[in-house]
C-alpha cells in the first residue's frame, strides 16, 4: 500500500527531498498579455498547459521570472510591469519606468525579474502577465525571458 | 538520547534535508530606515522580532529581498539603496539611480532586489535598511516588498 | 564497492540531497571582459580556476550573478550587459540602458542580475562576461558583485 516504513529506498524517494522543477523560455511570438512559453524546456514534476505551469506535487515552491525588454521610446515614459499569477490571481508584480527623459531614443534595454515563495497545491497554475508584451525582446534575446519554479520543501 | 542510528524516521528527520524558511511582506506603515515586516507571513524554523528575521537552525541560507519603489521625481536624480544586514552589519547592497533626467515627472517606478548566500548561526539576525524608505510603495503594491530566506544546507 | 544498499548512513549521504555551492565576489582589479573572482569565497563541491567555476558533481544547478555598476555618464546612453556562459557559450544575458537622457551627470548607479537553472556535467565551466567591465563598481561596493551556484538536484 502507501506505507513504506520498512523499505529504505521507498522512504528515501519520499518527501523531504522530493524534487520538482521547471525552466521555460518565452515563446517566440507573443500576442496577448498572458505570456506563452516553449514547452520544450526543462519540466520535471510540473506540467505545461496553455501558458500555465501546472503543479503536480504539493509543497513550498520558489518561483522566479525574468524578462528582457527592448523599448523603442515614444515621446513619453513607459511603465513596464511583470505580474506573477497563481490560479489567475496576481500574487506579485514588479514595475520599472523607462524612457523617463521623454526623449525619442533609438532603444532602451531593461531587465525585470520577480520571485515568489509560496505553498502550491496539486493542479495550481502559475502564469505571467505583461501589459507591454510587445516590448519583450524575443528576437535578439530569446533565451533571456524565462519562468522557473522549483519545489523547496514538500513537508510541513 | 541524541543518537538515532537505528531509527530510520529519526535519521530522515535529521540534518542534510532539514528545512527552514521565511517569506514576509513589508509593513504597511514605515517610519524608519530599518524596515518592518508583517509577521503573519510564512515563517518556518525562523522567528520574526523587531524588524529582524532570527535564525533558529544553523546552516547555509539563501536570502533574497525585493522592493518596489514609486518615486515622485524632484529636480534632481535619486539614488535608491537596499541594504541587507546580518547581525546589524551591512553585508550586501543594491543601488540604482532614478529620475536621472533631472525632470520633475509624475512618477517613476523602480524595482530593486538583492540576494545573499551565507552561513548563519542560531540567533543570527537578518534585516533590511533603506535610506529612502518613503519611496517604498506600500499602498499600490504592498505585496511586492518582501524579505525571504531559506536554508539550503545545514551540513558542513 | 559502490553499492551501499544495506548501509543507512551511506545511502543518506548519497544523491538526492548531495550539496554543492559557491559564492564568490568579483576580483578587485578587472582588466578584461571575462570577469575574475576572489577564490577565497565560499566553495563547496565546486572549484575555481581562471575566472571559471568548475563543476565537480553533475546535476541541476541554480546559477545567479549580480553586479553593481557605477557609470560616469558620457554624452550618450550606455548599454550595460551581463552574460552568463556555460562552457564558454553564452547561455543567458541581461541588458539595461542607463544615461538615457544623454546628459553628462556625475554618476548613475545600476544593479543588474541574471539567473539560470541548468543541468551541468562534471568539469562544466561557469563564467561571466561584461563588455563594460570598467563600470563595475569594485571600489565603493566590492561585496555587491557576486557569482553564486548551488546544486538543486543531482537525481534525474
Amino acid at each position: 500500500g502507501g506505507n513504506c516504513s520498512e523499505d529504505l529506498l521507498c522512504i528515501l524517494k519520499r518527501a523531504p527531498f522530493k524534487k520538482s522543477w521547471a525552466y521555460l523560455q518565452v515563446a517566440k511570438h507573443l500576442n496577448k498579455t498572458k505570456l506563452s512559453w516553449n514547452k520544450d524546456g526543462i519540466l520535471h514534476g510540473v506540467r505545461y498547459q496553455d501558458g500555465n505551469l501546472v503543479i503536480q506535487f504539493p509543497g513550498l515552491y520558489f518561483i522566479i521570472c525574468q524578462l528582457q525588454f527592448l523599448v523603442q521610446c515614444p515621446n513619453n515614459s513607459v511603465d513596464l510591469k511583470l505580474e506573477l499569477l497563481i490560479n489567475k490571481h496576481i500574487k506579485k508584480q514588479a514595475l520599472v519606468t523607462v524612457c523617463e527623459s521623454g526623449m525619442q531614443t533609438k532603444h532602451v534595454y531593461q531587465n525585470l525579474s520577480q520571485f515568489l515563495l509560496d505553498y502550491l497545491q496539486v493542479n495550481t497554475t502559475v502564469s505571467v502577465n505583461v501589459d507591454t508584451f510587445q516590448y519583450i525582446d524575443t528576437s535578439t534575446f530569446p533565451l533571456e525571458n524565462v519562468l522557473s519554479v522549483f519545489l523547496y520543501s514538500n513537508s510541513d | 538520547g541524541g543518537n538515532c542510528s537505528e531509527d530510520l524516521l529519526c535519521i530522515l528527520k535529521r540534518a542534510p534535508f532539514k528545512k527552514s524558511w521565511a517569506y514576509l511582506q513589508v509593513a504597511k506603515h514605515l517610519n524608519k530606515t530599518k524596515l518592518s515586516w508583517n509577521k503573519d507571513g510564512i515563517l518556518h524554523g525562523v522567528r520574526y522580532q523587531d524588524g529582524n528575521l532570527v535564525i533558529q537552525f544553523p546552516g547555509l541560507y539563501f536570502i533574497i529581498c525585493q522592493l518596489q519603489f514609486l518615486v515622485q521625481c524632484p529636480n534632481n536624480s535619486v539614488d535608491l539603496k537596499l541594504e541587507l544586514l546580518i547581525n546589524k552589519h551591512i553585508k550586501k547592497q543594491a543601488l540604482v539611480t532614478v529620475c536621472e533626467s533631472g525632470m520633475q515627472t509624475k512618477h517613476v517606478y523602480q524595482n530593486l532586489s538583492q540576494f545573499l548566500l551565507d552561513y548563519l548561526q542560531v540567533n543570527t539576525t537578518v534585516s533590511v535598511n533603506v535610506d529612502t524608505f518613503q519611496y517604498i510603495d506600500t499602498s499600490t503594491f504592498p505585496l511586492e516588498n518582501v524579505l525571504s530566506v531559506f536554508l539550503y544546507s545545514n551540513s558542513d | 564497492g559502490g553499492n551501499c544498499s544495506e548501509d543507512l548512513l551511506c545511502i543518506l549521504k548519497r544523491a538526492p540531497f548531495k550539496k554543492s555551492w559557491a559564492y564568490l565576489q568579483v576580483a578587485k582589479h578587472l582588466n578584461k571582459t571575462k570577469l575574475s573572482w576572489n577564490k577565497d569565497g565560499i566553495l563547496h563541491g565546486v572549484r575555481y580556476q581562471d575566472g571559471n567555476l568548475v563543476i565537480q558533481f553533475p546535476g541541476l544547478y541554480f546559477i545567479i550573478c549580480q553586479l553593481q555598476f557605477l557609470v560616469q555618464c558620457p554624452n550618450n546612453s550606455v548599454d550595460l550587459k551581463l552574460e552568463l556562459l556555460i562552457n564558454k557559450h553564452i547561455k543567458k544575458q541581461a541588458l539595461v540602458t542607463v544615461c538615457e537622457s544623454g546628459m553628462q551627470t556625475k554618476h548613475v548607479y545600476q544593479n543588474l542580475s541574471q539567473f539560470l537553472l541548468d543541468y551541468l556535467q562534471v568539469n562544466t565551466t561557469v563564467s561571466v562576461n561584461v563588455d563594460t567591465f570598467q563600470y563595475i563598481d569594485t571600489s565603493t561596493f566590492p561585496l555587491e558583485n557576486v557569482l553564486s551556484v548551488f546544486l538543486y538536484s543531482n537525481s534525474d
Partner: antibody
Framework: EVQLVESGGGLVQPGGSLRLSCAVS????????MSWVRQAPGKGLEWVGR??????????DYAAPVKGRFIISRDDSKDTLYLQMNSLKTEDTAIYYC????????????????WGKGTTVTVSS | DIQMTQSPSSLSASVGDRVTITCRAS??????LAWYQQKPGKITHLLVY???TLQSGVPSRFSGSGSGTDFTLTINSLQPEDVATYYC?????????FGGGTKVEIK
C-alpha cells in the same frame, strides 16, 4: 566564561624565531575566526593577522609588515591558536594579544570582545 | 589599505562633560567599525560594534554613530573610570586597521 591565554613570549635575537600559543576556552573554537594584535611599547594597537574557521576554508590574512615571516595556524582539537614568528626584527618587539576576530559577530554572533592579557616578545641583540 | 585617522590624539575634560572622539576611514567601510577601550595593565574591552551597537554590559553613556567614512564615539557624561585610551578599528577589509588612539584624561 570566555578566556584567552597567550604564552610563548620571551627575549629573542634579531633573525630568530618564536612560537606563541593561545589557549581558548568558553567558545566553540572550531567556529571562531581568530586574530593576533600587537602593541609596541608606548604605541597604539596594530593588527597582525587572522585565521578563518574551517567552514570558511581556514585561510589566513596578514598585515604587510609580517607577511612572509609570520604564520598563523590553529589546532581545533586542542582549542589552540598559534603564531609562528620567523626572521624576527627589532620592530617586532611588542605585547602580542590573541583575540576573537570581529567577523565572528557577522558570522557567529559573538564579537571581538574577548582579548587575552598578552604575552611580551622582545627582539634585541 | 584603509587608513583610520582618529582625532584628537588626546583630550582632557571634566567629570560630567560630553566627550566626542571622531574616526575617519580613507574609504567607505559601511558600518564595519568597532570602538575599544584600553586601560593600562587591563584587558582591552569592546565598547561598540557595527558603528553604533553598544556591546552588552557597556554603560549607556557610551554611544557610536556614523557610516561610510565618518564615525563618532560619544561619552555623554564623562566618569572617572572612563580614563583610558580609545581605539577605532576598521574590520571591513584586511588589514583590519586601527586608529591611532585617543587618550582621555580628567581635568
Amino acid at each position: 566564561e570566555v578566556q584567552l591565554v597567550e604564552s610563548g613570549g620571551g627575549l629573542v635575537q634579531p633573525g630568530g624565531s618564536l612560537r606563541l600559543s593561545c589557549a581558548v576556552s568558553g567558545i566553540t573554537f572550531s567556529n571562531a575566526w581568530m586574530s593576533w594584535v600587537r602593541q609596541a611599547p608606548g604605541k597604539g594597537l596594530e593588527w597582525v593577522g587572522r585565521i578563518k574557521s574551517k567552514t570558511y576554508g581556514g585561510t589566513t590574512d596578514y598585515a604587510a609588515p609580517v607577511k612572509g615571516r609570520f604564520i598563523i595556524s590553529r589546532d581545533d582539537s586542542k582549542d589552540t591558536l598559534y603564531l609562528q614568528m620567523n626572521s624576527l626584527k627589532t620592530e617586532d618587539t611588542a605585547i602580542y594579544y590573541c583575540t576573537t576576530d570581529p567577523w565572528n559577530y557577522v558570522n557567529y554572533n559573538y564579537f571581538m570582545d574577548v582579548w587575552g592579557k598578552g604575552t611580551t616578545v622582545t627582539v634585541s641583540s | 589599505d584603509i587608513q583610520m585617522t582618529q582625532s584628537p590624539s588626546s583630550l582632557s575634560a571634566s567629570v560630567g562633560d560630553r566627550v566626542t572622539i571622531t574616526c575617519r576611514a580613507s574609504q567607505d567601510i559601511r558600518n564595519y567599525l568597532a570602538w575599544y577601550q584600553q586601560k593600562p595593565g587591563k584587558i582591552t574591552h569592546l565598547l561598540v560594534y557595527a558603528a553604533s551597537t553598544l556591546q552588552s554590559g557597556v554603560p549607556s553613556r557610551f554611544s557610536g554613530s556614523g557610516s561610510g567614512t565618518d564615525f563618532t564615539l560619544t561619552i555623554n557624561s564623562l566618569q572617572p573610570e572612563d580614563v583610558a585610551t580609545y581605539y577605532c578599528q576598521n574590520y571591513f577589509s584586511v588589514p583590519l586597521t586601527f586608529g591611532g588612539g585617543t587618550k582621555v584624561e580628567i581635568k
